[in-house]
């Protein structure tokens, strides 16, 4: 009995439907075929749990948070193997293990072994504004969100005609900061912040009004 | 009580101009964005433009860049839209929206009764 | 542009019952919701705004609640004064967006 070589890992957006690949060859007919579907959660790697199981020509539930979101891609028994699992969420990332047995057939490599990541595009941002808005004035825009597998990366543009900052903004991209030092009336404006990974953008938009100081009356 | 009056509206020809006007009273206008919005017939709302408080700033929706202009006066407490190159398809009710203050940008916390628009030869 | 979805476009109903119109976004928009009514002839009135609050006059019997993609506003007990058309419109992105309008009519 052999289980072929699987691509590595599987990644999928979170919601949908994860395929995990795991098939093999035999010499035997498939009246004995026992299979075992393990994950490693990459959340808790000190905590294997069974998905599912086919034995004995039937099929068996594994961990409750799988029930009815796993099954089999084909009828079993089948050489492939492969199962999809519906509706995938964040805790679904893990090292997933197929251990197949076909007796009388022994020997050869009986496991199969595919990582799975379930990627999350960014939430909304929160941009906000520290520092004093007063002319001559330091202040850093902030933006980050509170979701986003891969972490996201942050990107502010000036809504105006250029979509430039102003010259005298410095940004981190990764933090999702603009310092702009010595604020003056052509920093004012409305800015957006755009938190992107590699399945998706969101974005939040902050308003920046210097004031002036208000002339003394004499 | 915050109050926005328009008025300019009317029946306009394919490629005329038209500049509405909306009078804000009831608040401090010059700390406000202002924005306006509009509504063809039996259709949705659309946002059109944008201005900050001090004017400094101005947006506009792609459907309009380069023939709408927003601009204000303070002093007059006045919003105002100049409409060029109008087509068919500018034909709508126009509203124009206060924004509610700071963080908020891009909410439209009051609105004017709006000005009909009608562009047709 | 971020687009918006409300659903249903039209529904029927009668004074007493509890309405619900949903509202999804393109894209994750986290709070930056609000929602306006608008009578026939009448300008649009901010109703709700950030997805939850009430806007200040706005009687009680109108919620909002959702964050992300997914919002509902409801009408907890529908009044005759009540029957118009909704709207839900985002402030996370430019261009500020609508969604197409829910019209809520006498059964």
């Known amino acids: 009995l052999e289980v072929s070589e699987s691509p590595g890992s599987v990644q999928v957006a979170r919601g949908q439907t994860a395929v995990l690949p795991c098939a093999f060859s035999t010499s035997a007919a498939l009246l004995n075929l026992n299979v075992i579907w393990m994950v490693i959660p990459l959340s808790n790697a000190n905590q294997p749990e069974q998905v599912i199981l086919y034995q004995g020509g039937q099929m068996f539930d594994g961990a409750l948070r799988f029930h009815g979101r796993v099954g089999f891609t084909g009828t079993m028994p089948a050489t492939n193997v492969s199962i999809f699992i519906n509706n995938t969420q964040l805790s679904d990332t893990g090292t997933y293990q197929c251990l197949v047995n076909n007796l009388p057939d022994r020997g050869g490599r009986n496991i199969g072994v595919t990582g799975l990541t379930v990627l999350v595009p960014p939430s909304a941002p929160q941009c906000q504004i520290q520092g004093s808005q007063d002319l001559g004035s330091d202040v850093i825009l902030l933006c980050s969100s509170e979701e986003g597998i891969p972490r996201p990366t942050y990107l502010w543009e000036k809504l105006d005609n250029t979509l430039k900052l102003p010259p005298t903004a410095t940004q981190d991209q990764v933090q999702g900061t603009v310092t702009i030092r010595n604020i003056s009336a052509l920093s004012s404006g409305l800015y957006q912040c755009v938190a992107s990974n590699a399945i998706g953008t969101s974005t939040c938009l902050l308003d920046l009004q210097v004031i002036s100081p208000q002339p003394r009356s004499v | 009580e915050v109050q926005l009056l328009e008025s300019g509206g009317g029946l306009v020809q394919p490629g005329g101009s038209l500049r509405l006007s909306c009078a804000a009273s009831g608040f401090t206008f010059s700390s406000y964005a202002m924005s306006w919005v509009r509504q063809a017939p039996g259709k949705g709302l659309e946002w059109v433009s944008a201005i900050s408080g001090s004017g400094g700033s101005t947006y506009y929706a792609d459907s309009v860049k380069g023939r709408f202009t927003i601009s204000r006066d303070n002093s007059k407490n006045t919003l105002y839209l100049q409409m060029n190159s109008l087509r068919a398809e500018d034909t709508a009710a126009y509203y124009c929206a206060r924004m509610a203050a700071g963080a908020s940008w891009g909410t439209f916390d009051y609105w004017s009764q709006g000005t009909l628009v009608t562009v047709s030869s | 542009d971020i687009q918006m979805t409300q659903s249903p476009s039209s529904l029927s109903a009668s004074v007493g019952d509890r309405v619900t119109i949903t509202c999804r976004a393109s894209?994750?928009?986290?709070?930056?919701l609000n929602w306006y009514q608008q009578k026939p002839g009448k300008a649009p009135k901010l109703l709700i705004y950030?997805?939850?609050s009430l806007q200040s006059g706005v009687p009680s019997r109108f919620s909002g609640s959702g964050s992300g993609t997914d919002f509902t506003l409801t009408i907890s007990s529908l009044q005759p004064e009540d029957f118009a058309t909704y709207y839900c419109?985002?402030?996370?992105?430019?261009?500020?967006?609508f969604g197409q309008g829910t019209k809520v009519e006498i059964k």
């Open positions: 950030a997805a939850s």
């Open positions: 419109q985002q402030r996370s992105g430019s261009p500020l967006t």
């Open positions: 894209q994750s928009i986290s709070s930056y």
